[in-house]
């Protein structure tokens, strides 16, 4: 349908293809591409060749080709400033001659490992309250956090910690809609030192 | 209701130039190709090329590569095909046509005639 | 280039019979979902009419007496039963590659 909106998620510096999905190649004739200015037109290429992309835009220079025999449309060397909205008007031999698909594109960062940090709130009878904050290096759009072996979600965890669980290691992975990376720390480290008392501490 | 409006009749000498206009008017200019064609008593119809007016992109038959230009003005709904160093080979009716691939609506012709 | 021969370059029939048209491509310009061949009845002093796009589907406010058939290289245009308005020439036209061809035509004349 012409008002469905097809999210499409790239990673920044890498490539992403915009799914036109021509079932009929021999229909087209050009497929126009707009953002927030004209893109790029798209024609068929000789028989066997892949179609012919005329880029509009100097920002898109040297950035875009099209796959045979589908039309797909590939960006590559992404920059944040390519996310948005992309409309492509496809014109057909085929009734009503032009149609056209909308897409959304997501811009995000490849995640690097995360870091752990750990705050000794306080310490009872060989029992000693934790406090872990799980962070990516720079603030990121649509992370999510998990930690296993708990299943608990978002960036921080409270655990307190008895003698018997010193052999769990707590992982936090950080996750985005492109990549998920994690960070590890051991039990033994969290109460290692109590006679220090609050202190944080960073892994990695 | 879709229009094709083109000049009856044009008279130009060997050796220079004629520009045909082709005025649109009924439908949305943009999305359909503006296709010329080329009628000579006893040779049948020849496609001469089409364009594309939101682009400018152009398609040719080979045989009239170096014969035929074509131009759209988007602000007039009108395409144009230039014939250059006219022959009496040249001498025929002239369609426009719109439509992507097969031609729905047509033009009523312009006839060029090349005398001295 | 695809060369479209027609057959025959005249025909007369007569009145409320069938007249058959043929066309045949020097090549395919069929797929398995579609053939790129259409046909236009073009009468004296008048633009081409296109009646029949892709082989066989008719094109709206065409009469229902005109039908399309065939696919691969031999495709035919069937006016059954002709009327007398039905004078004219015939063509088709293939849009498989560029440059779109038409075949030679053929006069159609009711007796």
């Known amino acids: 349908k012409d008002s469905e909106i097809f999210t499409v998620n790239g990673i920044l510096g890498e490539s992403v293809t915009f799914p036109v999905n021509i079932q009929e190649p021999r229909q087209v004739k050009i497929i126009a591409w707009t953002s927030k200015t004209s893109v790029a037109y798209v024609t068929p290429g000789d028989s066997e060749t892949a179609p012919v992309v005329t880029v509009t835009h100097r920002n898109y220079y040297e950035r875009i080709h099209a796959l045979g025999p589908n039309y797909n449309l590939v960006i590559s060397d992404l920059r944040m400033e390519d996310a948005g909205d992309y409309k492509a008007d496809i014109n057909t031999q085929a009734d009503p001659y032009t149609t056209t698909k909308r897409y959304n594109l997501q811009i995000y960062r490849r995640l690097g490992k995360p870091k752990i940090t750990q705050s000794l709130m306080a310490s009872v009878n060989s029992t000693c309250n934790v406090t872990l904050t799980c962070s990516v290096e720079k603030e990121e759009k649509n992370v999510t956090y998990n930690w296993s072996p708990l299943g608990e979600e978002g960036n921080v965890l409270q655990i307190f910690q008895t003698p018997e669980d010193q052999e769990l290691t707590y992982t936090c992975t950080a996750q985005n809609p492109v990549s998920n990376n994690s960070d590890s720390i051991s039990a033994r480290q969290l109460c290692a030192d109590i006679a220090m008392g609050f202190r944080t501490h960073h892994t990695g | 209701q879709v229009q094709l409006q083109q000049p009856g009749a044009e008279v130009v000498q060997p050796g220079t130039s004629v520009k045909l206009s082709c005025k649109a008017s009924?439908?949305?200019?943009?999305n359909y190709w503006i296709n010329w064609v080329k009628l000579r008593p006893g040779q049948g119809l020849e496609w001469?090329?089409?364009?594309?007016?939101?682009?400018?992109?152009?398609n040719y038959n080979e045989k009239f590569k170096r014969k035929a230009t074509l131009t759209v003005d988007t602000s007039s709904s009108t395409g144009n095909m230039q014939l250059s160093s006219l022959a009496s080979e040249d001498s025929a009716l002239y369609y426009c046509?719109?439509?992507?691939?097969?031609?729905?609506?047509w033009g009523q012709g312009t006839l060029v005639t090349v005398s001295a | 280039d695809i060369v479209l021969t027609q057959s025959p370059a005249s025909l007369a029939v007569s009145l409320g019979q069938r007249a058959t048209i043929s066309c045949r491509a020097s090549?395919?310009?069929?797929?398995?979902?579609?053939?790129?061949m259409h046909w236009y009845q073009q009468k004296p002093g008048q633009p081409p009419k296109l009646l029949i796009k892709?082989?066989?589907n008719l094109e709206s406010g065409v009469p229902a007496r005109f039908s399309g058939s065939g696919s691969g290289t031999d495709f035919t245009l069937n006016i059954h039963p002709v009327e007398e308005e039905d004078t004219a020439t015939y063509y088709c036209?293939?849009?498989?590659?560029?440059?779109?061809?038409f075949g030679g035509g053929t006069k159609l004349e009711i007796k």
């Open positions: 892709f082989a066989s």
């Open positions: 036209q293939h849009s498989w590659e560029i440059p779109y061809t």
């Open positions: 046509a719109s439509g992507t691939g097969r031609f729905a609506y």
């Open positions: 001469i090329g089409d364009i594309y007016p939101v682009s400018g992109t152009t």
């Open positions: 009924g439908y949305n200019f943009t």
């Open positions: 090549q395919s310009v069929s797929t398995s979902s579609y053939s790129y």
